[in-house]
Amino acid sequence: PLATIPVSTTSLTSSEGSTISTPSVDISTPVTTSIVGDQCSRCKNGGFWDGLKCQCLTPYYGESCEEVVNSIDIAPPETVSAQMELTVTVTSVKFTDELKNHSSQEFREFNKTFTEQMNIVYSGIPEYVGVNITNLRLGSVVVEHDVLLRTKYTPEYKTALDNATEVVKQKITKVTTEQIMTNDNCSALMCFNTTGTQVQNITVTQYDPVEECRQKAEEYEDYFLVEYRDQKPYCISPCESGFNASKNCNHGKCQMSQNGARCLCVTTETHWYSGEDCNQGTQKSHHHHHH
């Protein structure tokens, strides 16, 4: 979790006005004080006793797993990928049953040449990883294959992969239109039948940080949200400081409840603080309000 400022007072008043006694704790740091007695009932919210302390489930922490964390770790994948299932018809190679056998000389040579040809076709696409032949069948040689695309995860990864799949379609259409047999001759690496080019299916990695955040937040799902920093998603509650959605509790401590984030206002030697954001100070001696 990201850093929060520790609160050093034990006397807190909720924004509704009632005084609450609470441990003096930086709510981003788990408390590991030993507890004597029946530990099974001490670990709340699904937490379990490991012999020393409560092991809490996300999104809880604390001595008894009674507090809600300000931020939840969500880990988007380093890279995201797309797989395109394509079919092309190669006319410059005669089909034999040996092409069905992936350990045969025929298949190995065809695979090498086809891969070389596709690497040339897709050379300008930064997301392009390679091709993988899944099946070869008669007619001249119908090549069922996957085109593999990969890119670094960013919030816009779907757009990047969608654009890459469009470029793949354009490039394979172009090469299978241009590299064709003329007068029974093919002077290219491979020649194709223009009408045999088809995109069967496209599968794109599905990753939704908002969904992961909501799932991990469990019953607090309505109060946790995703914000980005340096293109990395953070799953935060309004009690996490330093984000657009952060709640400013001024003279108080932010605490999550099942009704959302609320401010627990501090009482100092000189002032009482109140209000939804603990921004209304009342001087104890003069009962003077200032904002």
Epitope: K94, T96, N185, C186, S187
Partner: nanobody
């Protein structure tokens, strides 16, 4: 994997003949075969090609002077070069296509196996 080894190169006078041979380590029956050459400081160019069924193709610069042939039983390819000229000086290498390659009725540039080559120098 097919290994190709060329032989028959050497120094020859203009107007004379030379026969190049290429021995393949594996079956060439179902392959298109071809001869390429690369003159010093120049790009490699196709000289002659022959399909599985014996149909041949030649570069314009050698038509009528060079003849390509194959002996599938011996897994060998040949290039008969007549009326040699100074501009024929080059490193000559033979090449084999993938198995079952079709459509190489003229010069094809789709060869996945190539030999190291044999040097032909035409000079008086």
């Amino acid at each position: 994997e097919v290994q190709l080894v060329e032989s028959g190169g050497g120094l020859v006078q203009p107007g004379r003949s030379l026969r190049l041979s290429c021995a393949a380590s594996g079956d060439i029956t179902r392959r298109c075969m071809g001869w390429f050459r690369q003159a010093p400081g120049k790009e490699r160019e196709g000289v002659a090609g022959i399909s599985e069924d014996g149909i041949t193709g030649y570069a314009d610069s050698v038509k009528g002077r060079f003849t390509i042939s194959r002996d599938n039983a011996k897994n060998s390819l040949y290039l008969q070069m007549n009326s040699l000229r100074a501009e024929d000086t080059a490193l000559y290498s033979c090449a084999a296509s993938i198995l079952n390659r079709v459509g190489c009725r003229q010069l094809s540039y789709e060869y996945i196996y190539r030999g190291q080559g044999t040097m032909v120098t035409v000079s008086s």
